[in-house]
Interface confidence: low
């Protein structure tokens, strides 16, 4: 297993609709054909997996149907979008990238993106 640098923004503010997007970029030392991207959330010293996707280079990321994550890939960049966020979901979101194939296996973990989520004030006289 070899280390790989992963870069991601330090801070992102979720939209009023609870959507946050950020880019996870990895310095691929070789020509990987299969890449696995995992988003981890760290809060109160606990780390949990938010979502994960394995994709073949040149193809779209495929998350589970009920996943709160979507994403696209372009070269060594992955554009990640997390939706359905609420204020309680504020935390450090860490991008983990694994180059699964071909060998050698590479692992890279970003420093994390602090996502701030602010629940919107309900609009007066709104119907939704």
């Amino acid at each position: 297993c070899k280390a790989m640098h992963v870069a991601q923004p330090a801070v992102v503010l979720a939209s009023s609709r609870g959507i946050a997007s950020f880019v996870c970029e990895y310095a691929s030392p070789g020509k990987a054909t299969e890449v696995r991207v995992t988003v981890l959330r760290q809060a109160d010293s606990q780390v949990t997996e938010v979502c994960a996707a394995t994709y073949m280079m040149g193809n779209e990321l495929t998350f589970l149907d009920d996943s709160i994550c979507t994403g696209t890939s372009s070269g060594n960049q992955v554009n990640l979008t997390i939706q359905g966020l609420r204020a309680m979901d504020t935390g450090l979101y860490i991008c983990k990238v694994e180059l699964m194939y071909p060998p050698p296996y590479y692992l890279g973990i970003g420093n994390g993106t602090q996502i701030y989520v602010i629940d919107p004030e309900p609009c007066p006289d709104s119907d939704f």
């Epitope: 979502c51 994960a52 983990k96 699964m100 973990i109």
Partner: antibody, heavy 123, light 107 residues
């Protein structure tokens, strides 16, 4: 104390699908990784794959085309489906728990195992 | 896949003996190795993780060492309950793989 109990059809015909389940008691299925490992009679251990309670999976490439692991958090159960089986799939199928820090900080090993359920593939 | 080769495959020893089992990886796996004990008809039991860290509740007569490609499991003074089959497992990369096992028998 967390306990894992595997169950399922003991006999499966060739070309069919074997489908053991693993019931977790004494603790929650949440926040852990759950692996399936098999052991052919008189042989060693082979990792089949894992599932996280949220549903994300990782499979052994040698079995990937035939394997599906799923989880039902409401029943505290995970299940394995292995399709197009042959006699070579005859084995004792174990489920096991991995600590949830594996993906980031550390890996504590598969610390809780079930006794396994025997699946025989025969016509 | 990373291959793990254990030696010996069979080992005869007596109560009170000091025994060592080795596990060699086909490529470097840093310290990402675990050891398990399995008795007939029972589930495997985690003994050691991270090559040398003793799992909670495991007797101190068990110890592990090594890094890279060569690892050892040592039992300092064999007890009757230690006769079993021992497996190493790597988690440096997917798929996880196990050694073929070492069967420890009473001499």
């Amino acid at each position: 104390e967390v306990q894992l109990v595997e169950s399922g059809p003991g006999l499966v015909k060739p070309s069919e699908t074997l489908s053991p389940t693993c019931t977790v008691s004494g603790g929650s299925i949440s926040s852990y990784y759950w692996s399936w490992i098999r052991q052919p009679p008189g042989k060693g251990l082979e990792w089949i794959g894992y599932i996280y309670y949220s549903g994300s999976t990782n499979y052994n490439p040698s079995l990937k085309s035939r394997v599906t692991i799923s989880v039902d958090t409401s029943k505290n159960q995970l299940s394995l489906k292995l399709s197009s089986v042959t006699a070579a799939d005859t084995a004792l199928y174990h489920c096991a728990r991995e600590d949830n820090w594996r993906n980031y900080y550390y890996y504590y090993g598969m610390d809780v195992w079930g006794q396994g359920t025997t699946v025989t593939v025969s016509s | 896949d990373i291959q793990l080769t254990q030696s010996p495959s069979f080992l005869s020893a007596s109560v009170g003996d000091r025994v060592t089992i080795t596990c060699r990886a086909s490529q470097g796996i840093r310290s990402y190795l675990a050891w398990y004990q399995q008795k007939p008809g029972k589930a495997p039991k985690l003994l050691i993780y991270a090559a040398s860290t003793l799992q909670s509740g495991v007797p101190s007569r068990f110890s592990g060492s090594g890094s890279g490609t060569d690892f050892t499991l040592t039992i300092s003074s064999l007890q009757p309950e230690d006769f079993a089959t021992y497996y190493c497992q790597q988690y440096n990369s997917y798929p996880y793989t196990f050694g073929q096992g070492t069967k420890l028998e009473i001499k």
